[in-house]
């Protein structure tokens, strides 16, 4: 029951996370014009991964797509790639996890197959979450770098006579959506991996023993099937795995920590 709950919750959390990653990727507010300590302008600039927008105080908003591929900063391309990889992996993970759900019966799929699928989807969710977190963090790092660069020369001009407003950009809503979504996908993936351990049929750790019945030279070797009256709590005959109790050690890489103009 706990396994089903863990798996189900992991699936739901990952689903929300991936929806968030998709939303963040599509959002225009990855970077927004910094209003603090700046002249109050009648226009508000904000940028996304795919287009930049200007909202005028009149209420009109104009967005322009980045119609060039080669002319864009490498970092922006990298962030796009990370987010897309995250979405693709997450989507595949969701598809796999649907079939892996304990509450869904598909033909005569064995628990071992479900366990493997759960683990696969879990790993996919973890990588998807890490891709999103990495993508958002790379963009944020670019923003921070550019912010301080533009702060250093906030106003430029000939001898201070003519001032040019230097537009500085700060973190947009999409960054926070991306971080949270990436984190949720990661948590969901971990939950799926935990659920996988519970789904895997229990293994026996006892050694094979030969029983000599009188008049017969038959050796009974436990290992193929569990006796219904014998060891373990299961009353059904289940195929078990040879070898000791297996542990799943999840290899997890942590994220490393953009404004483009």
């Amino acid at each position: 029951m706990a396994v089903t709950a863990c798996q189900g919750l992991g699936f739901v959390v990952s689903l929300i996370g991936i929806a968030g990653i998709i939303a963040a990727t599509c959002m225009d507010q990855w970077s927004t014009q910094d209003l603090y300590n700046n002249p109050v302008t009648a226009v508000f600039n904000y940028q996304g991964l795919w287009r930049s927008c200007v909202r005028e105080s009149s209420g009109f908003t104009e967005c322009r797509g980045y119609f060039t591929l080669l002319g864009l900063p490498a970092m922006l391309q990298a962030v796009r790639a990370l987010m897309i990889v995250g979405i693709v992996l997450g989507a595949i993970g969701l598809l796999v996890s649907i079939f892996a759900l304990k509450c869904i019966r598909i033909g005569s799929m064995e628990d071992s197959a479900k366990a493997n699928m759960t683990l696969t989807s879990g790993i996919m969710f973890i990588v998807s979450g890490l891709c999103a977190i990495a993508g958002v963090s790379v963009f944020a790092n670019m923003l921070v770098t550019n912010f301080w660069m533009s702060t250093a020369n906030m106003y430029t001009g000939m001898g201070g006579m003519v001032q040019t407003v230097q537009t500085r950009y700060t973190f947009g809503a999409a960054l926070f959506v991306g971080w949270v979504a990436g984190g949720l996908t990661l948590i969901g993936g971990v939950m799926m991996c935990i659920a996988c351990r519970g789904l895997a049929p229990e293994e026996t750790n006892y050694k094979a023993v030969s029983y000599h019945a009188s008049g017969h030279s038959v050796a009974y070797k436990p290992g193929g099937f569990k006796a219904s009256t014998g060891f373990g709590s299961n009353t059904k005959n289940k195929k078990i795995y040879d070898g000791g109790a297996r542990t799943e050690d999840e290899v997890q890489s942590y994220p490393s920590k953009h404004d483009y103009v």
Partner: antibody, heavy 117, light 113 residues
Framework: QVQLKESGPGLVAPSQSLSITCTVS????????ISWVRQPPGKGLEWLGE???????NYNSALKSRLSISKDNSKSQVFLKMNSLQTDDTARYYC???????????WGQGTTLTVSS | DIVMTQSPSSLTVTAGEKVTMSCKSS????????????LTWYQQKPGQPPKLLIY???TRESGVPDRFTGSGSGTDFTLTVSSVQAEDLAVYYC?????????FGPGTKLELK
Amino acid sequence: QVQLKESGPGLVAPSQSLSITCTVSGFSLTSYAISWVRQPPGKGLEWLGEIWTGGGTNYNSALKSRLSISKDNSKSQVFLKMNSLQTDDTARYYCGRLSYGNSLDYWGQGTTLTVSS
Amino acid sequence: DIVMTQSPSSLTVTAGEKVTMSCKSSQSLLNSGNQKNYLTWYQQKPGQPPKLLIYWASTRESGVPDRFTGSGSGTDFTLTVSSVQAEDLAVYYCQNNFIYPLTFGPGTKLELK
């Protein structure tokens, strides 16, 4: 068609308050922002402030302390309130509709305000 | 506040003549986000409210004759009337539409000889 019409008291005594109404037709205040501009007799234009579609406002810093702009979307009316009036507040007051580039594409005919005792 | 200066303060011209008037701002009106200059030109005839001619420094408002042309970027802007007509006699104002408060220039008065 788009129309803006200002209506005001005409004559106000010094230190008194003023309320001018801008009634619009042909468009909605939920879609367009409105700006207020005044012009003293024989002089140039002075921007007073504006009210955005969501109800947010921005005022001329020199007049901010005694200026207030509000609106009633359902009545298609924008209100300009100004207190502590002085003789140099005598001017023709215009309301205009904000358009692309924050420009004013439609203006009212204006209402003349005279501050005199 | 941004200071807008217009020159000349008045112009006396003959019909059919080409006229150029200048507007300068104390700060750049160029928005880096869309590379547009937030400067507007208005025409005001006696006893009438101002009329929008040009926005974004060079975009002509619909219905405005093509003899009116706006140009310039950053801090220096120009309004050109290619062939002045009698109906063009008015005061021309430029306005900063970028940084609050949205200040107007003092105006350039166009008169006929």
